[in-house]
Interface confidence: medium
């Protein structure tokens, strides 16, 4: 039960990539507004997105304080123009979100190949260490900062002239692979957290090929 003409939010969903974290819900409001609260299991509730007509709320600033905590959010519904009004139980109508643990659940963003360098029959491929919105001491932390050795990268590489792919893995941001001299290769990388049960892999990076601008070549 709730206040006349207000409906509870539903389909509360966390959308999170590289810790940029937004809570979304339905329905689009008709004569009502929403306020969101977020808390850890042991913490106090903090209100965000006060009396909004949006159906999303950016909670990044809260979850980045400790990305390993488990968070719960709730969305309150109020009649538009009468936000003091409460439900029959003496409080506004609200709905809880699923629990969300950023470290375990945030989606890994699409990685980018920063550079590749060929020296003879070896190619060094470097993945850009993407910055997240986790911030400490005026430092935007990179994915590697946050995940450490939990994060690996998988490299897919193939000769430009064929479709047969090879793979390599690294728990740093660099690969050193053997290639055939005189052949051009294409590369794509994927971020992976093997220990996860969900959202384990990112989408593949854009493909970069030798003979294009991105690389650097020193044939010896």
């Amino acid at each position: 039960s709730g206040t006349t003409n207000t409906v509870a939010a539903y389909n509360l969903t966390w959308k999170s990539t590289n810790f940029k974290t937004i809570l979304e819900w339905e329905p689009k409001p008709v004569n009502q507004v929403y306020t969101v609260q977020i808390s850890t299991k042991s913490g106090d509730w903090k209100s965000k997105c006060f009396y909004t007509t949006d159906t999303e709320c950016d909670l990044t600033d809260e979850i980045v304080k400790d990305v390993k905590q488990t968070y719960l959010a709730r969305v309150f519904s109020y009649p538009a123009g009468n936000v003091e009004s409460t439900g029959s139980a003496g409080e506004p109508l609200y709905e809880n979100s699923p629990e969300f643990t950023p470290y375990l659940e945030t989606n890994l963003g699409q990685p980018t190949i920063q550079s590749f360098e060929q020296v003879g029959t070896k190619v060094n491929v470097t993945v850009e260490d993407e910055r997240t919105l986790v911030r400490r001491n005026n430092t935007f932390l990179s994915l590697r900062d946050v995940f450490g050795k939990d994060l690996i990268y998988t490299l897919y590489y193939w000769k430009s002239s064929s479709s047969g792919k090879k793979t390599a893995k690294t728990n740093t941001n660099e690969f050193l692979i053997d290639v055939d001299k005189g052949e051009n290769y294409c590369f794509s990388v994927q971020a992976v957290i093997p220990s996860r049960t969900v959202n384990r892999k990112s989408t593949d990076s854009p493909v970069e090929c030798m003979g294009q601008e991105k690389g650097e070549f020193r044939e010896i």
Epitope: S42, D66, R131, N137, T139, F140, S142, T172, N173
Partner: antibody, heavy 121, light 106 residues
Amino acid sequence: EVQLVESGGGLVQPGGSLRLSCAASGFTFTEYHMSWVRQAPGKGLEWVGFIRNRANAYTTEYAASVKGRFTISRDNSKNSLYLQMNTLRTEDTAVYYCARLTMVVAEFDYWGQGTLVTVSS
Amino acid sequence: DIQMTQSPSSLSASVGDRVTITCQASQDINKYLNWYQHKPGKGPKLLIYYTSTLQTGVPSRFSGSGSGTDFTFTVSNLQPEDIATYYCLQYDNLLTFGQGTKLEIK
């Protein structure tokens, strides 16, 4: 295996200079923030400063007690961290440790064995 | 710089006791406070981060609480291996250690 080995400590007169080195191995040096921490005889730990990683352009921060006198730098091609100490004071006497810093939770996760700097006339 | 005042500077307790150490910041540091354990000849070890989150592998007898400027570290069932010096460390604005608390067993 991660290893940090400091060197360069010794006896120096007040007003003098000294350069400490820290050789790092066992990890991709450019990906990590690095820090210096010191401990004066019979006293507690004191953070000296840190240098950020490649993703943060190797920028530096210092404790107020050493700002303007000490400079942290790194040579990534040599996997080495440095602490240039100028205008040394007697209160700078301490064992100086280099440590790898995981910034997300401010964890010094690996430490060197330390090198003693004595400032005395 | 933010100053951290840690007390007591030393304390002696018996095995099984509950011991408490406090740390006070000179300004609001949110919950960006860690507790380290330092044993002679070893590098300091992170026990608790972000005021109350136990680092992986740390026994649950260690706990922390607080926010803003006042923080508390507790060992609930003191063990012989807990003999060490304990430090708080703020990381809201740069880094500052507390002066340390030397914990001894009676």
